[in-house]
C-alpha cells in the first residue's frame, strides 16, 4: 500500500545532517611497502572560491619509528585557505602556490606543483614514487588522511570511479545532506520520525556508523523514533541527547554502553517502505528523511519536537 507522505526539503533551521565518509567519486588505494616515499594525491574541486579546508595527516609509529617520508600532491581548481595539521610527519607538500594559502606557516618542505591536467599530475607524482592513494573530492570541508594505513589489495593505484578509501581517507563534504520531511496522512498525535538511510558502499566489509542525534527540545516534549536503515554489514553506534524509540537494521549500541549490542530488525530498503515503517510506528510527522553514502559519522541536528513541520 502506498504511503501518502510528500517528502519536501526541510529548511536548515529545522534539520541539518552532516557526515564523514570514505566514499569518493574517483579513487584508489594501493600497497607500496618497499617504497622510499609514500605518495598521496588529492584532486579537490571547489564550486566557488575561496574555500576553507582543514587537512589532517595522521601517522602511527611503526616499530617505534616515524613512518617513511611522505609526498602529498594537492591539486585544487580554485583558491583555498588551508589549515594543515601534520605534526611530526616528514612531509613534502606539492601544491600550486597561487591557489593554496596557508592559515599558518606549514612547517613542511614544499614544492611548486606544475599546472598540469589531472593525468600529468598523476604521472608527475608517480615519477617520484609509487602512489599509495589518490582521490577526487568534491567540495570538502575537512579531510583526514591516515598514513601507513593502505589496505589495498592492489600493488598499484589506478583511479576508478566510486571508490571506498577505507581507513586511508575520510572526508566531510561542505554541503550538508538533503533533509526532507513530510506529514503522514491519517495518523493522529505528535510522534515524529527521523529516518536515516545509508546507501551501500563500494566495499562490503563490516562497518560501524556513529550516529549523533541532537534534538533541541525539552526532554519531556519529545515523542520520537529514530529509524536507521543500511546494508547488512553496517552496525550503529548511537549518541543521542534524548530518549527515543530506536528502529534499525543490523545491530546497534549506545555510546554510553558501547559494548552492549542490541539486535535490530529487517527493514525495507526503499524510501516508500521506510515511510510505511514510520507510519506503522505511529509517527505522524517525518521530521527528517535523509539518504547518505556509506558514512563513518553522521550528525543530525533537528528542532522539530513534534511541532509543525516546516518545509523550505
Amino acid at each position: 500500500e502506498t504511503v501518502h507522505c510528500d517528502l519536501q526539503p526541510v529548511g536548515p533551521e529545522r534539520g541539518e545532517v552532516t557526515y564523514t565518509t570514505s566514499q569518493v567519486s574517483k579513487g584508489c588505494v594501493a600497497q607500496a611497502p618497499n617504497a622510499i616515499l609514500e605518495v598521496h594525491v588529492l584532486f579537490l574541486e571547489f564550486p566557488t572560491g575561496p574555500s576553507q579546508l582543514e587537512l589532517t595527516l595522521q601517522a602511527s609509529k611503526q616499530n617505534g619509528t616515524w613512518p617513511r617520508e611522505v609526498l602529498l600532491v594537492l591539486s585544487v581548481n580554485s583558491s583555498v585557505f588551508l589549515h594543515l595539521q601534520a605534526l611530526g610527519i616528514p612531509l613534502h607538500l606539492a601544491y600550486n602556490s597561487s591557489l593554496v594559502t596557508f592559515q599558518e606557516p606549514p612547517g613542511v618542505n614544499t614544492t611548486e606543483l606544475p599546472s598540469f591536467p589531472k593525468t600529468q599530475i598523476l604521472e608527475w607524482a608517480a615519477e617520484r614514487g609509487p602512489i599509495t592513494s589518490a582521490a577526487e573530492l568534491n567540495d570538502p570541508q575537512s579531510i583526514l588522511l591516515r598514513l601507513g594505513q593502505a589496505q589495498g589489495s592492489l600493488s598499484f593505484c589506478m583511479l576508478e570511479a566510486s571508490q571506498d578509501m577505507g581507513r586511508t581517507l575520510e572526508w566531510r563534504p561542505r554541503t550538508p545532506a538533503l533533509v526532507r520531511g513530510c506529514h503522514l496522512e491519517g495518523v493522529a498525535g505528535h510522534k515524529e520520525a527521523h529516518i536515516l538511510r545509508v546507501l551501500p558502499g563500494h566495499s562490503a566489509g563490516p562497518r560501524t556508523v556513529t550516529v549523533k542525534v541532537e534534538l533541541s527540545c525539552a526532554p519531556g516534549d519529545l515523542d520520537a523514533v529514530l529509524i536507521l536503515q543500511g546494508p547488512p554489514y553496517v552496525s550503529w553506534l548511537i549518541d543521542a541527547n534524548h530518549n527515543m524509540q530506536i528502529w534499525t537494521t543490523g545491530e546497534y549500541s549506545f555510546k554510553i554502553f558501547p559494548e552492549k549490542n542490541i539486535r535490530g530488525f529487517k527493514l525495507p530498503d526503499t524510501p516508500q517502505g521506510l515511510l510505511g515503517e514510520a507510519r506503522m510506528l505511529n509517527a505522524s510527522i517525518v521530521a527528517s528523511f535523509v539518504e547518505l553514502p556509506l558514512a563513518s559519522i553522521v550528525s543530525l541536528h533537528a528542532s522539530s519536537c513534534g511541532g509543525r513541520l516546516q518545509t523550505s
Epitope: N34, L37, T119, L122, E123, A126, E127, M158, L159
Partner: antibody
C-alpha cells in the same frame, strides 16, 4: 585490448616534412599521455616528447622543439607527429607509446613503429 | 641531461646461467625502468620502479639498485630471454634511456 596502430613506412626527400600517425584504441585516451620515441640505426632510444589528449598540451625534449610538432585528434583517438626540414639524421624508426602513471609513469604500451627513410 | 650507461653493451650466456647487466646514471635517480626489445619488434615494459615486474614477466627476472647504480638479473637464462634490454629514468628532464645491453645465447 589496448592497441596503438601506427601509420606505414615513409620514404621522403631531404628538406621536406612528414606526418606520422598513431591510432589508439581499447582505453580512455584522456587518462594517459601519448609519447614519441626515436630509435636510430644504432638502436638507442631517444624520447622526443609527449602530448595530453585532454587539452593538447605538449612537452618536448629541447633538441626536438624545432623538429617535431605533436598534435591529437580526439574524435578519432589519434595522435600525430610532424617532422620538418628532414635530413638523413632523421632516418629512424619512430614509436608512439602510452604512459601509465600506475606503472611508475613508464611506457606500458607501444605502437609497432614507423620507419622513416630520408633519401634523395 | 642524465646519461644512462649500460654495461656490457653485448653479452652472451648459456641456457640456465645466471645473467646480470648494469645501468649507471650520471646523476642519482630514484628509480629505473627496464624494457625488453626483440629484433624487429617494439620495446616492452619489463621492470618498473627498479624492482617491480610488469605483467607477464617471468619471475626469473629481478631488478635492484639505488642512487647511480642499478641492475637487471635473470636467475636462469632461457632461450626466450635473448633480446636487447634498455634502462630508463624519469626523474630528471629530459627522460633518457641507456644505450642497451644485447643479450645473446651462447
Amino acid at each position: 585490448e589496448v592497441q596503438l596502430e601506427q601509420s606505414g613506412p615513409e620514404v621522403v626527400k631531404p628538406g621536406t616534412s612528414v606526418k606520422i600517425s598513431c591510432k589508439t584504441s581499447g582505453y580512455t585516451i584522456t587518462e594517459h599521455t601519448l609519447h614519441w620515441i626515436k630509435q636510430n640505426q644504432g638502436k638507442s632510444l631517444e624520447w622526443i616528447g609527449g602530448i595530453n589528449f585532454d587539452n593538447g598540451g605538449t612537452t618536448y625534449r629541447q633538441k626536438f622543439k624545432d623538429k617535431a610538432t605533436l598534435t591529437v585528434d580526439k574524435s578519432s583517438s589519434t595522435a600525430f607527429m610532424e617532422l620538418r626540414s628532414l635530413t638523413s639524421d632523421d632516418s629512424a624508426v619512430y614509436f608512439c607509446a602510452r604512459r601509465a602513471y600506475y606503472y611508475g609513469s613508464a611506457f606500458d604500451y607501444w605502437g609497432q613503429g614507423t620507419t622513416l627513410t630520408v633519401s634523395s | 641531461e642524465n646519461v644512462l650507461t649500460q654495461s656490457p653493451a653485448i653479452m652472451s650466456a648459456s641456457l640456465g646461467e645466471k645473467v646480470t647487466m648494469t645501468c649507471r646514471a650520471s646523476s642519482s635517480v630514484n628509480y629505473v625502468y627496464w624494457y625488453q626489445q626483440k629484433s624487429d619488434a617494439s620495446p616492452k615494459l619489463w621492470i618498473y620502479y627498479t624492482s617491480n615486474l610488469a605483467p607477464g614477466v617471468p619471475a626469473r627476472f629481478s631488478g635492484s639498485g639505488s642512487g647511480n647504480s642499478y641492475s637487471l638479473t635473470i636467475s636462469s637464462m632461457e632461450g626466450e630471454d635473448a633480446a636487447t634490454y634498455y634502462c630508463q629514468q624519469f626523474i630528471s628532464f629530459p627522460y633518457t634511456f641507456g644505450g642497451g645491453t644485447k643479450l645473446e645465447i651462447k
